[in-house]
Interface confidence: low
Amino acid sequence: LYFSRDAYWEKLYVDQPAGTPLLYVHALRDAPEEVPSFRLGQHLYGTYRTRLHENNWICIQEDTGLLYLNRSLDRSSWEKLSGRNRGFPLLTVYLKVFLSPTSLREGECQWPGCARVYFSFFNTSFPACTSLKPRELCFPETRPSFRIRENRPPGTFHQFRLLPVQFLCPNISVAYRLLEGEGLPFRCAPDSLEVSTRWALDREQREKYELVAVCTVHAGAREEVVMVPFPVTVYDEDDSAPTFPAGVDTASAVVEFKRKEDTVVATLRVFDADVVPASGELVRRYTSTLLPGDTWTQQTFRVEHWPNETSVQANGSFVRATVHDYRLVLNRNLSISENRTMQLAVLVNDSDFQGPGAGVLLLHFNVSVLPVSLHLPSSYSLSVSRRARRFAQIGKVCVENCQAFSGINVQYELHSSGANCSTLGVVTSAEDTSGILFVNDTKALRRPKCAELHYMVVATNHQTSRQAQAQLLVTVEGLYVAEEAGCPLSCAVSKRRPECEECGGLGSPTGRCEWRQGDGKGITRNFSTCSPSTKTCPDGHCDVVETQDINICPQDCLRGSIVGGHEPGEPRGIKAGYGTCNCFPEEEKCFCEPEDIQDPLCDELCREQKLISEEDLGGEQKLISEEDLHHHHHH
């Protein structure tokens, strides 16, 4: 048995006569043979669940659920109750109604076996019938909503009449009906005004019914109509077995280049028309078991369960359902020499499913783990400027498919044939397992005899000792020209284009910094800045060469503070900036400020503000005023 609502409302007036019927509570059956029996909790409660007094005023008919006044609530009783309400005015009291058999201890009141009946308390006598508005004659102040369990026997779940009105104002005629689409499973009996279900409901066909209750009031010659929403929610039970969408119970996958722990190898989706068990219970009650295979398989794979609520269309309305994604995941990094094929089975069990049939599915994963061979092209040929600065990136080496690798460790080394011309270094990029070639020794670069540099590139997977080799020929081009005096170590220091382009800086392949002109669109990823090479800096990512020295690309790598309009990078650098961004790596600071070029938006007030802030104010105040300036520009 369960209540069709978790709360009921009615009004109570001082000196309402004993015997006044108040309202009906309704219970619906879980099984055809059940017979409801109602009992009231012993106490009346007030504000903040304060226990006010033993309930001496309201009784219930155990078989019908009718609540009525056993004795009139007079003014002195009302004052006694008010005095116990923690000093709050007594506006609402409530009673608990239980469905027997339940424990006789009056504890928490939880649906489905308990409902609360709230009484709005009026410190006046019942109003004259003629003064009641149609709305007050028809419906309680609080709109009811109903909960009906699916697949349960049909039954009565509401009674429209406001019983005190009917009892005290017999001359007013009130009629009710339900507006509903054809064929809906609800009926309002014209005589008793009881609303009942015609048949058991199926939540998987329809979950919510947004009906409208229509009340027609006849008082003398006048007739008025009042309409209120009458929502019914169908509650779910686990009556649907899990199924495979599109009948797909098998997934095939190849593990080749993605061999990293936590890689999702394959996914199978299971659909369940139910939304129970609820999310808190779901993973415990909806189990997935990787069926025993060999030890290698058990150690290498795990199954992850990812449930998600979805909605599906059923007969023109949307109902909630659940999709369960079962992901086969690598439990560890796989060696590149690993080579095997296996079939894995996963048993999925909807343990709450109550038949017919079993709530069990078998998922099949066919997995091939292929070995990975390391191959390099037979040779590489590159050129480098004699003016290149240290840490200038001049190219990449990459074993075949290295961009697709994850969980595969490849280390690159350069072996130089001429000891005095060992100009380049190589570092392995964590992102794509490539090797980035960079200038490591600028002195060697300037030696006339080092016009051609010969290297052997060796790529090694240390776990298996597998190797690949390739020749690398580097041609050194151009003349060395000494740099202007007073140029900073980092290109990023320069705030204007002319000073940027006349200097070099760490990481510059040409020996000159490059200016990147931004798009001027507020706080943008494409901010103006000075860079050693716009191919690599800034690109929102601090690469493995740039990590060698903070002066190369602080725009991507700085962990310090950024002043002005910006969005910080994750985990470091400037993701987006306002105007021009320049940096002082030693001070671990970057500044993003409006472009210096005259902006039509920058009116007299703006220029004055800037003048004051630059000439007259101290450091901290200067930043504040420039912030204001940013806002001025921005708006």
Partner: antibody, heavy 120, light 107 residues
Framework: QVQLVESGGGVGQPGRSLRLSCVAS????????MHWVRQAPGKGLDWVAI????????YNVDSVKGRFTISRDNSKNTLYLQMNSLGAEDTAIYYC?????????????WGQGTLVTVSS | DIQMTQSPPSLSASVGDRVTITCRAS??????LNWYQQKPGKAPKILIY???RLQSGVPSRFSGSGSGTDFTLTISSLQPEDFATYYC?????????FGGGTKVEIK
């Protein structure tokens, strides 16, 4: 309301090809798995092929594997069946059917069917 | 592949009769069984899904039961519009397979 309309049937010669189409309306096509089911004259129903809602899962019954290809264009709300190397045993009414969103692989809506006759 | 065997292949009955059609699967399929009705010249129409659940809009005189390998479709009181061919179908695994059909004719 939900509608499935097949076309492309007709007389095909043995060894030749035909392409069937099924235009869907009245529901969000991209959310539903779709099937082809056929029925030889005076005979029972035979499932032919299935395609997942996003086009990613394609399965054909063994008797048509390597000859028939199921595909879909979600932007055009259209399901296709490309039939190559036709044989007399492929003569049938071909129905496209929508998979029920509630019950898994149950066909809740069917087209009216298109007749394919393979004859020299 | 899972074979579905329907019996009887045909039956004659009168209006008001109770009619029972059975379907047997070659292996256990839980409750993954559907029943369809097909009238001459028309596409099939779903009646029962998940072995026993009535599709919305289908009259309540149709009912389904069974689980595992043996299933039954029952028409409690045959109506004139019920004369048709009935097919069972398993949705347990691909390839999906139908029973051979049961033709219900007027006696």
């Amino acid at each position: 309301q939900v509608q499935l309309v097949e076309s492309g049937g007709g007389v095909g010669q043995p060894g030749r090809s035909l392409r069937l189409s099924c235009v869907a309306s009245g529901f969000t096509f991209r959310n539903y798995g779709m099937h082809w089911v056929r029925q030889a004259p005076g005979k029972g129903l035979d499932w032919v092929a299935i395609i997942g809602y996003d086009g990613s899962k394609e399965y054909n019954v063994d008797s048509v594997k390597g000859r028939f290809t199921i595909s879909r264009d979600n932007s055009k709300n259209t399901l296709y069946l490309q039939m190559n190397s036709l044989g007399a045993e492929d003569t049938a009414i071909y129905y496209c059917a929508r998979e029920s969103p509630i019950t898994g692989t149950t066909f809740d809506y069917w087209g009216q069917g298109t007749l394919v006759t393979v004859s020299s | 592949d899972i074979q579905m065997t329907q019996s009887p292949p045909s039956l004659s009955a009168s209006v008001g009769d109770r009619v029972t059609i059975t379907c047997r699967a070659s292996q256990s399929i839980g409750n993954y069984l559907n029943w369809y009705q097909q009238k001459p010249g028309k596409a099939p129409k779903i009646l029962i899904y998940a072995a026993s659940r009535l599709q919305s809009g289908v009259p309540s005189r149709f009912s389904g039961s069974g689980s595992g390998t043996d299933f039954t479709l029952t028409i409690s009181s045959l109506q004139p519009e019920d004369f048709a061919t009935y097919y069972c179908q398993q949705s347990y695994s691909t390839p999906l397979t139908f029973g051979g059909g049961t033709k219900v004719e007027i006696k």
